[in-house]
Interface confidence: low
Amino acid sequence: YDFTNCDFEKIKAAYLSTISKDLITYMSGTKSTEFNNTVSCSNRPHCLTEIQSLTFNPTAGCASLAKEMFAMKTKAALAIWCPGYSETQINATQAMKKARKSKVTTNKCLEQVSQLQGLWRRFNRPLLKQQ
């Protein structure tokens, strides 16, 4: 999906009002220095591409993020403020339904959500300072 047509200010507002708090809740009990940020982005569309990938694509050791509150709110924000986004996500929704129903917070998931926090922070202050 091409995120260049999204309403970035509205997505930023959604992040600041709710998504950021849900990410903090998920990470509660984890030290902020525990994980190194290895994923970055160079501008807002690029950040949203990386955020979508980390939030909704199951990875080895972390298959369940899509059912978390921050993920559902992220999906809603993208669906509302990115024209045509919902239509591109039909296959992704089918895959999500097949994911395990139980929420398991693994260390890998915590690391992934830590990366997401960094991407969202970068989304609010775009422009990668070092490529």
Epitope: R44, H46, P126, L127
Partner: antibody, heavy 117, light 107 residues
């Protein structure tokens, strides 16, 4: 109305320094990065580097690292770009330009720096 | 560093002509490309960003497109005020780089 107003033309001798200013108005100064772009006479545009006005973090391309110092004064919403040890090849028009996503929606009017003995 | 190769370096055209300027990136920059217009003695002006989004106040005769690493700026019907130099610039990450420019002259 967004405006970037740069300081006037400068004529300097080789070896001297010059400080170009770029005063921003009409928007929140710390929200946007400030970039500087060089245009030598009859040449194209060359990106020099950028400064984040919120924390003064700068990124310069290698060729300008020993030549350029970028600073900001948040109290006056002004960005500065200082060129040191001036040589003839520093003769150019220097532009400030603001950006959020890497493209420049507003530019200063340009400051001509002439280095001549 | 990402290199931006712009062509042609200059072209002659008449009012009403369709003009196409291309820019090729040395690697994938997705849609992160801007186009600027510069007239003699003036600052560059943003025309297009994210490869195909028209900047505010830019006439609809200007359009941008992308195919892989090749980007195109098209002026559908050249007007007298369009005679200028045009630059592409990638905005994918540091260091930002510009194309060499295309000077559009009156035939």
């Amino acid at each position: 109305e967004v405006q970037l107003v740069q300081s006037g033309a400068e004529v300097k001798k080789p070896g001297a320094s010059v400080k170009v200013s770029c005063k921003a108005s009409g928007y929140t100064f710390t929200t946007y990065w400030m970039h500087w772009v060089k245009q030598a006479p009859g040449q194209g545009l060359e990106w020099m580097g950028m400064i984040d006005p919120s924390d003064s973090e700068t990124t310069l391309i290698q060729k300008f690292k020993d030549k350029v110092t970028m600073t900001v004064d948040k109290s006056t919403s002004t960005a500065y770009m200082e060129l040191s040890s001036l040589r003839s090849e520093d003769t150019a028009v220097y532009y400030c330009a603001r950006t959020l996503d890497g493209y420049y929606d507003y530019w200063g009017q340009g400051t001509t720096v002439t280095v001549s003995s | 560093d990402i290199q931006m190769t712009q062509s042609p370096s200059s072209l002659s055209a008449s009012v009403g002509d369709r003009v196409t300027i291309t820019c090729r990136a040395s690697e994938n920059i997705y849609s992160y490309l801007a186009w600027y217009q510069q007239k003699p003695g003036k600052s560059p002006q943003l025309l297009v960003y994210f490869a195909k989004t028209l900047a505010e106040g830019v006439p609809s005769r200007f359009s941008g497109s992308v195919s892989g690493t090749q980007f195109t700026l098209t002026i559908s019907s050249l007007q007298p005020e369009d005679f200028a130099t045009y630059y592409c610039q990638h905005h994918y990450g540091t260091p930002w780089t510009f194309g060499g420019g295309t000077k559009v002259e009156i035939k």
